[in-house]
Interface confidence: medium
């Protein structure tokens, strides 16, 4: 699986979409999990409704919500009030029994709030103790990176 990068602005909501083959994954519940280290397990954050027919209903765990369009074949995860510690590697999964198929590998990048003067975002330079004023990246951008080309997840 290639990894898709989703960028969101700190304090705002980020929507992550995971398309899948609706026929292949018919009747399967879905889940959103966080990758713990490069080779570590994927820790479940939230999963769709226990009744597959009700998968369209939004389920929440803290600031993370999940909903599944089973006909269209799109799993949508919403991260509310995005924070730097939300940055990292995740997976969208399709569940069957005790097994899980990976639908998409995701890297969430958290960008500083353009109005937040505490962080310089993309104009911060490590060689100076004083940072630039703003962060300047559009809300909710996604792009694909090839395997081996993934930047380290940002840290708080």
């Amino acid at each position: 699986h290639n990894t898709t990068v989703f960028q969101g602005v700190e304090g705002q909501s980020l929507q992550v979409s995971c398309p899948y083959d609706s026929m292949k994954h018919w009747g399967r519940r879905k889940a959103w999990c966080r990758q713990l280290g490069e080779k570590g397990p994927c820790q479940r954050v939230v999963s769709t409704h226990n009744l597959w027919l009700l998968s369209f209903l939004r389920r929440r765990n803290g600031s993370t919500a999940i909903t599944d369009d089973t006909l269209g074949g799109t799993l949508t995860i919403t991260l509310r009030n995005l924070q730097p510690h939300d940055a990292g590697f995740y997976q969208c999964q399709s569940l069957h029994g005790s097994e899980a198929d990976t639908l998409r590998k995701v890297l969430v990048e958290v960008l500083a709030d353009p109005l937040d003067h505490r962080d310089a975002g993309d104009l911060w330079v490590p060689g100076e103790s004083e940072s630039f004023e703003d962060a300047h990246v559009e809300h909710s951008i996604s792009r694909s990176l090839l395997e081996g080309e993934i930047p380290f997840p940002p840290t708080s």
Epitope: L123, V125, P126
Partner: antibody, heavy 122, light 113 residues
């Protein structure tokens, strides 16, 4: 698709003034820092100035400090460079560039406009 | 200011052969807090604006062919084109994104032998 289109270049006498503009489209302009980078004919790249997304903070290269002013109008999605007291050594193609974002990524430029040529000569 | 020095000034390489460009910074651009080197590479084809290829010394920008790779740490860096293609004819610039003012190397012109 992100597009940056510079304008305002031309021939100006030493000591004269010129204002460059860069019209941006395809992204939320106010969320991004922007920069000017210049390239003298047949020479390398020289960073000139940068401005934050809100326009509240600016940086300048020593070679232009006090003579050039970077500004932006977020309602018009336009970046400006006011150039005063121009010298022959300011002759260059001036590129407008969008700065990448993200925690920990220092200032890198992507993408760039096609550039506008400023010639300072008597 | 950090001075960036590139070598060679120009390079002629046969199609399919390896091209290697060096860049040296006058002070380290390694940030110890995250162990990243704040060094970027750009490609400028004739009559075009520059294009970002690599940042953090070795992280390829999305869409950049994997024949382009960056390496090095501290003050010494290398851009390698593993198998030169006709479309790689360009001037390549290194840039430090470690401290203001941002500075570029003088450029290396890559041609086909």
């Amino acid at each position: 698709e992100v597009q940056l289109l510079e304008s305002g270049g031309g021939l100006v006498q030493p000591g004269g003034s010129l204002r460059l503009s860069c019209a941006a489209s395809g992204f939320t302009f106010s969320n991004y820092a922007m920069s000017w980078v210049r390239q003298a004919p047949g020479k390398g790249l020289e960073w000139v100035s940068a401005i934050s997304g809100s326009g509240g903070s600016t940086y300048y290269a020593d070679s232009v400090k006090g003579r050039f002013t970077i500004s932006r109008d977020n309602s018009k999605n336009t970046l400006y460079l006011q150039m005063n007291s121009l010298r022959a050594e300011d002759t260059a193609v001036y590129y407008c560039a969008k700065l990448r974002g993200g925690y920990e990524v220092g200032p890198t430029f992507d993408p760039w406009g096609q550039g506008t040529l400023v010639t300072v000569s008597s | 200011d950090i001075v960036m020095t590139q070598s060679p000034d120009s390079l002629a390489v046969s199609l399919g052969e390896r091209a290697t460009i060096n860049c040296k910074s006058s002070q380290s651009v390694l940030y110890s807090s995250n162990n990243k080197n704040y060094l970027a590479w750009y490609q400028q084809k004739p009559g075009q604006p520059p294009k970002l290829l690599i940042y953090w010394a070795s992280t390829r920008e999305s869409g950049v062919p994997d024949r382009f790779s960056g390496s090095g740490s501290g003050t010494d860096f290398t851009l390698t084109i593993s198998s030169l293609q006709a479309e790689d004819v360009a001037v390549y610039y290194c840039q430090q994104h470690y401290i203001w003012p941002i500075t570029f190397g003088g450029g290396t012109k890559v041609e086909i032998k």
